[in-house]
Interface confidence: low
C-alpha cells in the first residue's frame, strides 16, 4: 500500500491509518487458490476452491482504486446466467438462475481538506458505501404474480 | 454503538474510532429481508431474499460482541446438508453439497492499554483475523483419489 | 402399474367454477409433480399449471389470470384442479398429467390421466 | 411467454417413407425440449424427452435432434400405427408451452 496523509492529527496518523489499511480484507476464498485451469467456463469443476465447484460457479474480479481504502477489492463474477447440473458439471438448467450475492461495504476514499480560507490541508477520508458482489448462488427464479 | 476510548491520541479519538466504526458492516442482502414464513426449513423458496430463494438456503445468525468492531457480525448457516432440487424446491439431491463459504474479516478487539509503569490507559484496539461464513453455495463434491 | 383415473364429464354454466380430481395409483404420489394440462377442440394443448405434493408448491401459468388453483390430499393421493369464473372457451378436456424429472435435465410428462371433458354452455 | 411454432401443420406420407417434423422456438431453449404424441380420440403420451432421449416403449424409428431454437422429430420409416398429432413442448422456462401441432396421415 502507498502511504496517505490523513486528517487524524501527525500523533495519530499511524493509528488510525493502520486500522483502516486493515479494517477490510479481499473477499477471495480461504482455500488456496490454485490456477484453474478453466477459469472463465461455464461448468462445475470436482476440485478446486468453492467457486469454480459450485453449480453458479464464480470467478473474481479485481477491481483496484489507489485513491481508496482498501485499494483492492473482489468482485465475483457469475460464469453461467444459470446453474449447471450436478450430474454432468456441465449442462446449464434454465429452471435456476445463478445470482449475485451483493454486500454494501464501507469504503474511505481520499479527498483533499481543505483548511481555513479554502486552502489545501493534505487529504481527507471520505466514507461511503460501495456494492460488492460476494458470490454467485443458484436460486429458483422469483415468481411473478 | 457504545463509545469506546482509543489509543489514538485525543483530538484524533473521534476520526479513528468513527472510521473504524463504519469500516465493516453486516452481511445480509440488500432485498428487504422478509421474514420468512419457514425460516428453518430445507425449503428453496419462489420468493423472498437471496438466502431463500437459493437451493442451498441458509440463514443469518447474529454474533454480537461488545468488546468487538464491529460489535455485530453475521454467520450464515446452511439449512440444508445437500442441495434442494430445483424442480421441486424441496427434495434433496444428494450429488451436491451445501458448502459455507468464508471470509476472513479484520476485526478489532478493545483490550486495556498499559501506560508507563503498567498503569491502566483506557483501552486499545487489537487487529484480529476474524472467520465469518458469507453463505452457502451448492456445489459438486470434490473427488477424492 | 402407474395409473392416474380422473373424475367424470361436467357441463356448467358461465361464471360458475368446476373442480376436477385425478387419482394417482402406482408409484409414491409425493414424489412426482402433478401438471394439468387443457386442450380445446381442435387447439393445441395448454399448460395450465404443477404442484409439488410434498410441499404444496405450484405454479401457474399466468394465462389463466389467476382462476386456476391445484390443491392435493396426499392421504388420498389425489390432485385437484379448480377453474372458476368459467366461460364458453374454458370447454375442453383437462388432463392431469405426472411429471418424471432427474432434477436436472428432463422434465417430462410421462403418465397422463383419461381426461375430463367440462363443457361450459 | 416462450412460443414454439410447428411446421408443418399437417402432412400426408406413404409407409416407410422419412418423416421430418420440425419445431422453432421463439428463444433458445437449449435441449429443453419434448415431444408427445396423440392419436385420434386419445391421451397425449410422451415419445422423446430431452431433445433426443427416447421414452421407454417408444420404436426406434422415431428419433429428435437439435439445440438451442430449431429441433427435428424424425421417424425413419412411417407405420401406419404413426397416425397421429404430434406436439412438441419446452420446459426451458415456466409456463410450459406447447407447439400447434403437426397432424401425420397416411396417403
Known amino acids: 500500500y502507498s502511504h496517505w496523509p490523513s486528517c487524524c492529527p501527525s500523533k495519530g496518523q499511524d493509528t488510525s491509518e493502520e486500522l483502516l489499511r486493515w479494517s477490510t480484507v479481499p473477499v477471495p476464498p480461504l482455500e488456496p487458490a490454485r490456477p484453474n485451469r478453466h477459469p472463465e467456463s461455464c461448468r462445475a469443476s470436482e476440485d478446486g476452491p468453492l467457486n469454480s465447484r459450485a453449480i453458479s460457479p464464480w470467478r473474481y474480479e479485481l477491481d483496484r482504486d489507489l485513491n481508496r481504502l482498501p485499494q483492492d477489492l473482489y468482485h465475483a463474477r457469475c460464469l453461467c446466467p444459470h446453474c449447471v447440473s450436478l450430474q454432468t458439471g456441465s449442462h446449464m438448467d434454465p429452471r435456476g438462475n445463478s445470482e449475485l450475492l451483493y454486500h454494501n461495504q464501507t469504503v474511505f476514499y481520499r479527498r483533499p481538506c481543505h483548511g481555513e480560507k479554502g486552502t489545501h490541508k493534505g487529504y481527507c477520508l471520505e466514507r461511503r458505501l460501495y456494492r460488492v458482489s460476494l458470490a454467485c448462488v443458484c436460486v429458483r427464479p422469483r415468481v411473478m404474480g | 454503538y457504545s463509545h469506546w476510548p482509543s489509543c489514538c491520541p485525543s483530538k484524533g479519538q473521534d476520526t479513528s474510532e468513527e472510521l473504524l466504526r463504519w469500516s465493516t458492516v453486516p452481511v445480509p442482502p440488500l432485498e428487504p429481508a422478509r421474514p420468512n414464513r419457514h425460516p428453518e426449513s430445507c425449503r428453496a423458496s419462489e420468493d423472498g431474499p437471496l438466502n431463500s430463494r437459493a437451493i442451498s438456503p441458509w440463514r443469518y445468525e447474529l454474533d454480537r460482541d461488545l468488546n468487538r468492531l464491529p460489535q455485530d457480525l453475521y454467520h450464515a448457516r446452511c439449512l440444508c446438508p445437500h442441495c434442494v432440487s430445483l424442480q421441486t424446491g424441496s427434495h434433496m439431491d444428494p450429488r451436491g453439497n451445501s458448502e459455507l463459504l468464508y471470509h476472513n474479516q479484520t476485526v478489532f478487539y478493545r483490550r486495556p492499554c498499559h501506560g508507563e509503569k503498567g498503569t491502566h490507559k483506557g483501552y486499545c484496539l487489537e487487529r484480529r483475523l476474524y472467520r465469518v461464513s458469507l453463505a452457502c453455495v451448492c456445489v459438486r463434491p470434490r473427488v477424492m483419489g | 402399474e402407474v395409473q392416474l383415473v380422473e373424475s367424470g364429464a361436467e357441463v356448467k354454466k358461465p361464471g360458475a367454477s368446476v373442480k376436477v380430481s385425478c387419482k394417482a395409483s402406482?408409484?409414491?404420489?409425493?414424489?412426482?409433480?402433478m401438471n394439468w394440462v387443457r386442450q380445446a377442440p381442435g387447439q393445441r394443448l395448454e399448460w395450465m399449471g404443477l404442484?409439488?405434493?410434498?410441499?404444496?408448491?405450484?405454479s401457474y401459468n399466468q394465462n389463466f389470470k389467476g382462476r386456476v388453483t391445484l390443491t392435493v390430499d396426499t392421504s388420498a393421493s389425489t390432485a385437484y384442479l379448480e377453474l372458476n369464473s368459467l366461460r364458453s372457451e374454458d370447454t375442453g378436456v383437462y388432463y392431469c398429467?405426472?411429471?418424471?424429472?432427474?432434477?436436472?435435465?428432463?422434465?417430462?410428462?410421462?403418465?397422463w390421466g383419461q381426461g375430463t371433458l367440462v363443457t361450459v354452455s | 411467454d416462450i412460443q414454439m411454432t410447428q411446421s408443418p401443420s399437417s402432412l400426408s406420407a406413404s409407409v416407410g417413407d422419412r418423416v421430418t417434423i420440425t419445431c422453432s422456438a421463439s428463444?433458445?431453449?437449449?435441449?429443453?425440449l419434448n415431444w408427445y404424441q396423440q392419436k385420434p380420440g386419445k391421451v397425449p403420451k410422451l415419445l422423446i424427452y430431452?431433445?433426443?432421449s427416447l421414452h421407454s416403449g417408444v420404436p426406434s424409428r422415431f428419433s429428435g435432434s437439435g439445440s438451442g431454437t430449431d429441433f427435428t422429430l424424425t421417424i425413419s420409416s412411417l407405420q401406419p400405427e404413426d397416425v397421429a398429432t404430434y406436439y412438441c413442448?419446452?420446459?426451458?422456462?415456466?409456463?410450459?408451452?406447447f407447439g400447434q401441432g403437426t397432424k401425420l396421415e397416411i396417403k
Open positions: 402406482g408409484y409414491s404420489f409425493s414424489g412426482y409433480t
Open positions: 404442484i409439488n405434493p410434498y410441499n404444496g408448491g405450484t
Open positions: 398429467a405426472r411429471e418424471d424429472f432427474d432434477s436436472w435435465t428432463f422434465f417430462a410428462m410421462d403418465y
Open positions: 430431452y431433445t433426443s
Open positions: 428463444q433458445g431453449i437449449a435441449s429443453f
Open positions: 413442448q419446452q420446459y426451458s422456462s415456466f409456463p410450459y408451452t
